[in-house]
């Protein structure tokens, strides 16, 4: 087909991030076109000379595709019809990260929108009471984290407290050498009060809470992705 | 500021071999693409060589496919064109080039090389 | 492999509008760049994704593709626009136009 007009379509993109090790997508919507055959997707990646997917004529179009991105992009064929260019990336690597470009051609038109990809690891952090240690103790554990993530402990009771002094944060390095478990200890700690272990780093900011009393232990956990504009 | 500056272009013989080198600097040159383009006197562009940001992928035009070779180096930010069995055709000014998605947005100021017996 | 068509040469009157084409098969489907290179310099970037300005390019430049053909559109023409003019697309490499010779009369 050709494009016959001098239009452009709206692409709509979103800034997220992917889990190192695990699947992640690229957000893109578009103005769609009723025939599936005349519309052309292609994700294209700054600094690589490969196509990072194509689908066009209804089916993947993988014959210039760039060695890095072989066998782990796919879109939602069933959705490109009603505007969803999203990709599907599997196994996230660190070196996925960068800048992206969805590109759309449709009969009516043309138009591309960039997103910002971040990559790195985040988990959600369990808070325990250790009961093996002299004093009352709380354990803040999360499996996997790159990069090295901040770790801030606060309480309900003691609002804008620093428990730096009462606290002792390390870093251990998982066997694939890259993403790192975080264990934080707190010591001190005070019945009839909630605490809160906080794990940031540029990526993601994930919290755990523990609410002690005499007679109940009660958690929640809470993860949420920065700089991803919803 | 944003600036390439190629080096290295000279005479030579036919047959003879010449490296050039493209220096970056005012941008992270490790996340960028690079191309080589060339112009023969009097004539217009030809696009010779790209090289993806990590130097894993290289493509080239197939006047020049086995005979020139691209790489970089991002430690040093530059970019190089290695040229082997040189003949008179491969008279021009090359240029270096940032590719930006499916174009070029910045141009070095060109090197000449000239190969006459 | 894929070939770029344009004019050799557009002739303009100062203050007028020039138009020079790029001719090319299914075109419209592509992003098309315009180049702009005077004598004795490297080429520069003037319009790009077929009709956005980088910065520093004046709104005099504009740029348009559909169907078969891609145009580069300078309106109030002045004497420091005369270069030649080059059209550039992708194709697992890039691929140049023929190149136009803008003279301003």
């Known amino acids: 087909f050709g494009i016959s007009g001098r239009h452009s379509i709206t692409v709509t993109t979103v800034a997220s991030a992917g889990n190192i090790g695990e699947d992640g997508i690229l957000s893109c919507t578009f103005e769609p076109d009723i025939k599936l055959s005349d519309i052309v997707i292609q994700w294209l990646k700054e600094g690589v000379l490969g196509l990072v997917h194509e689908f066009k004529e209804g089916k993947d179009e993988l014959s210039e595709q760039d060695e890095m991105f072989r066998g782990r992009t796919a879109v939602f064929a069933d959705q490109v019809i009603v505007g969803n260019a999203s990709l599907r990336l599997k196994n996230v690597q660190l070196t996925d990260a960068g800048t992206y470009k969805c590109y759309i051609i449709t009969s009516k038109g043309k138009g591309n929108a960039n997103l910002e990809y971040k990559t790195g690891a985040f988990s959600m952090p369990e808070v325990n009471v250790d009961y093996n240690a002299s004093s009352e103790t709380l354990r803040c554990e999360a499996p996997r984290w790159f990069p090295q993530p901040t770790v801030v402990w606060a309480s309900q009771v003691d609002q804008g407290a620093n428990f730096s002094e009462v606290s002792n944060t390390s870093f251990e390095l998982n066997s694939e050498n890259v993403t790192m478990k975080v264990v934080s200890v707190l010591y001190n700690v005070t019945i009839n009060n909630t605490y809160s272990c906080m794990i940031e780093n540029d990526i993601a900011k994930a919290t755990g809470d523990i609410k002690v009393t005499e007679s109940e232990i009660k958690r929640r956990s809470h993860l949420q992705l920065l700089n991803s504009k919803a | 500021e944003v600036q390439l500056v190629e080096s290295g272009g000279g005479v030579v013989q036919p047959g003879r071999s010449l490296r050039l080198s493209c220096a970056a600097s005012?941008?992270?040159?490790?996340?960028?693409?690079m191309n080589w383009v060339r112009q023969a006197p009097g004539k217009g562009l030809e696009w010779v060589s790209a090289?993806?940001?990590?130097?894993?992928?290289?493509y080239y035009a197939d006047s020049v496919k086995g005979r020139f070779t691209i790489s970089r180096d991002n430690s040093k930010n530059t970019l190089y064109l290695q040229m082997n069995s040189l003949r008179a055709e491969d008279t021009a000014v090359y240029y270096c080039?940032?590719?930006?998605?499916?174009?070029?947005?910045?141009w070095g100021q060109g090197t000449t090389v000239t190969v006459s017996s | 492999s894929y070939e770029l068509t344009q004019p050799p040469s557009v002739s303009v009157a100062p203050g007028k509008t020039a138009r020079i084409t790029c001719g090319g098969n299914?075109?419209?489907?592509?992003?098309v760049h315009w180049y702009q290179q005077k004598p004795g310099q490297a080429p520069v970037l003037v319009v790009y994704?077929?009709?956005d300005r980088p910065s520093g390019i004046p709104e005099r430049f504009s740029g348009s593709n559909s169907g078969n053909t891609a145009t580069l559109t300078i309106s109030r023409v002045e004497a420091g626009d005369e270069a030649d003019y080059y059209c550039?697309?992708?194709?697992?490499?890039?691929?140049f136009g023929t190149g136009t010779k803008l003279t301003v009369l």
């Open positions: 080039a940032r590719k930006r998605w499916y174009g070029m947005d910045v």
């Open positions: 005012g941008f992270t040159y490790s996340s960028r693409a």
């Open positions: 090289i993806s940001s990590s130097g894993t992928t290289t």
């Open positions: 299914n075109i419209g489907s592509k992003s």
């Open positions: 994704d077929d009709s």
């Open positions: 550039q697309v992708w194709d697992r490499g890039m691929i």
